[in-house]
């Protein structure tokens, strides 16, 4: 084996494991990984007497190198004394030496958390004549700490006698207060509370916050619609900047990802509004998998006239998930509007609030412009709800009297969609051959007296259909009963509406 100098490690006990009445204590020095023999270990004990013992070297099995330990036992006033272990290895070089200086025992310590708190403004958002900054130095293992206040990096002449320290359990906290004039605070200087502890400096800084956004200009970043995400599988997010004053200099919208991975190519659109302002949008295609796995996307807006960049970020909504319940209804015929009907769809109790609503007729999706859907609103519980409204014409329902309301939502299983069909005339199902065979179970109004079915939407249920007890396999809500068909024969007529 070739010549190898040793690594040297101090060996100490934990302070809390040494009895307070101990009259002597032993510490050590480990020299390991050296070749060839020997090493020479000496101790500097200052003014204290001590006895040393160097153990015979042992061979490290795998490398063939050596290790040895030297022990020092001291008595008397050892508690605050520092000791130096000096290891020499002449085979490495005649002057090869490593010194380790340490105390008898090691204290494991928790460093402080430093936080500056600021006195609040008055009710109108104005600063009072003086501003108080409070430096909280918390959660550290008791020991000497020094607090210094800095203004723009320069030490301030502050009376620190007001600093107070408290101890809770094994940890201590200290606080120091700094009072500033309003003029100093508004001058945009940075104030730093600097804490020195165990040979390290911990700090927190603060200054008067700039206005949270440049006045007048707003930026918004949308999440992808569930339809684009789960059905089209080509999700996009859009960064929208509004109320820009048309001026020289370009508005820059820059996309980035929190993971640092590259972003796709974005498309940009500028529109001049009637009020003279400029609206800029940038649309970025995102990876379906990246989005679902929780990637964060950032849009950064810069412009020569903005005092600072606007930053917006978006990511998949966190929190609990709940699939939507979908209910579709047709309004009764209204006098004077025989050739038009309104269909309504209530979608409720879903979480999170991102949802896409579509209407289908003849298995074809109707254009979004045909229907109007509210923004998600909170229910009294923890979920959200929307209403969607669709106007249909007689020509449509005579062609096929079945319209489908479909909700696309991440919590809906198995395919992120839930849908319900609705007919304008549920009892006269469109005159097609299908009308002879409808489902053998339909919903009843809750609390309906058994055997007395009730007409809904102006049509008449079959006399032999009655409201039976709720069925576990019926997909509707539990408070609704089931209409059970009692007809006999090969092709019985069934009631397809509400009882």
């Amino acid at each position: 084996a070739s010549t190898q100098s040793p690594s040297v490690f101090p060996l100490t006990r934990c302070c809390k494991n040494i009895p307070s009445n101990a009259t002597s204590v032993t510490l050590g020095c480990l020299a390991t990984g050296y070749f060839p023999e020997p090493v020479m270990v000496t101790w500097d004990t200052g003014s204290l007497n001590g006895t040393t013992m160097t153990l015979p070297a042992t061979t490290l099995t795998l490398s063939g190198h050596y290790a040895t330990i030297s022990l020092l036992t001291v008595s008397g006033a050892w508690a605050k004394q520092m000791f130096t272990c000096r290891v020499a290895h002449t085979p490495s070089s005649t002057d090869w030496v490593d010194n380790k200086t340490f105390s008898v025992c090691s204290r494991d310590f928790t460093p402080p958390t430093v936080k500056i708190l600021q006195s609040s403004c008055d009710g109108g958002g104005h600063f009072p004549p003086t501003i108080q900054l409070l430096c909280l130095v918390s959660g550290y293992t008791p020991g000497t700490i020094n607090i210094t206040w800095l203004e723009d990096g320069q030490v301030m002449d502050v009376d620190l006698s007001t600093a107070s320290t408290t101890q809770e359990g094994e940890l201590a906290s200290t606080q120091s207060e700094l009072t500033l004039s309003q003029k100093h605070w508004l001058s945009d200087r940075t104030y730093t509370c600097q804490v020195t502890y165990q040979g390290h400096t911990f700090e927190d800084s603060t200054k008067k916050c700039a206005d949270s956004n440049p006045r007048g200009v707003s930026a918004y970043l949308s999440r992808p619609s569930p339809f684009d995400l789960f059905i089209r599988k080509s999700p996009t997010i859009t960064c929208l900047v509004v109320d820009l004053a048309p001026s020289k200099g370009t508005v820059n919208l820059t996309w980035s990802r929190a993971s640092g991975k590259p972003v796709n190519h974005s498309t940009r659109k500028e529109e001049k509004q009637r009020n003279g302002t400029l609206t800029v949008t940038s649309t970025l295609p995102v990876g379906t998998r990246d989005w679902i796995e929780g990637e964060t996307y950032q849009c950064r807006v810069t412009h020569p006239h903005l005092p600072r960049a606007l930053m917006r970020s978006t990511t998949k909504t966190s929190g609990p998930r709940a699939a939507p319940e979908v209910y579709a209804f047709a309004t009764p015929e209204w006098p004077g509007s025989r050739d038009k009907r309104t269909l309504a769809c209530l979608i409720q109790n879903f979480m999170p609030e991102d949802i896409s609503v579509q209407w289908l007729h003849n298995e074809v999706q109707l254009p979004d412009a045909r229907h109007s859907t509210t923004q998600p609103r909170k229910t009294k519980g923890s979920g959200f709800f929307v209403f969607s409204r669709l106007e249909v014409t007689r020509a449509e329902w005579e062609q096929k009297d079945e319209f489908i309301c479909r909700a696309v939502h991440e919590a809906a299983s198995p395919s992120q969609t839930v849908q319900r069909a609705v007919s304008v005339n549920p009892g006269l199902a469109g005159g097609s051959a299908q009308s002879q065979r409808a489902p053998d179970r339909v919903l009843c109004h809750s609390g309906q007296q058994q055997g007395l079915p009730r007409a809904a939407g102006g049509s008449v249920p079959h006399p032999r259909c009655h409201c039976g007890a709720g069925r576990a396999d019926w997909p509707g809500p539990p408070e609704l009963d089931v209409c059970v068909e009692e007809a006999e024969g090969e092709a019985p007529w069934t009631w397809t509406g509400l009882c």
Epitope: T110, P111, G139, F202, E203, D204, T296
Partner: nanobody, 128 residues
Amino acid sequence: DVQLQESGGGLVQAGGSLRLSCLASGRTFTTTSGYNMGWFRQAPGKEREFVAGIKWVSGSNRAYAESVKGRFTISRDNAKNTVYLQMNSLKPEDTAVYYCAAATGQSYVPIREYEYVYWGQGTQVTVS
């Protein structure tokens, strides 16, 4: 996992300046997830030692080793997922390999090597 990539090291004369950068990336790394970032250094034949640390979320919470206080400044840019170490008034004893490291879960800025979980490969700084 978190990946850390240092850059900006090099040869500089005593009294000069250097700015080191550390780019953080990875599926679990987001600037809001409570990471603490630190710079350590290791000179030949010496142990790795703490230089400076910063909290991602606040950015104003920092810690420095006494030997670099007033000369080195740690900062971060959330948008770029990058931590910087600005080193001024460099001395020959600042010569070392400088490592970027990430820790998570502490309310304070950690200063001990064992508290940091993720490490970069290091960048050499030589002060002549």
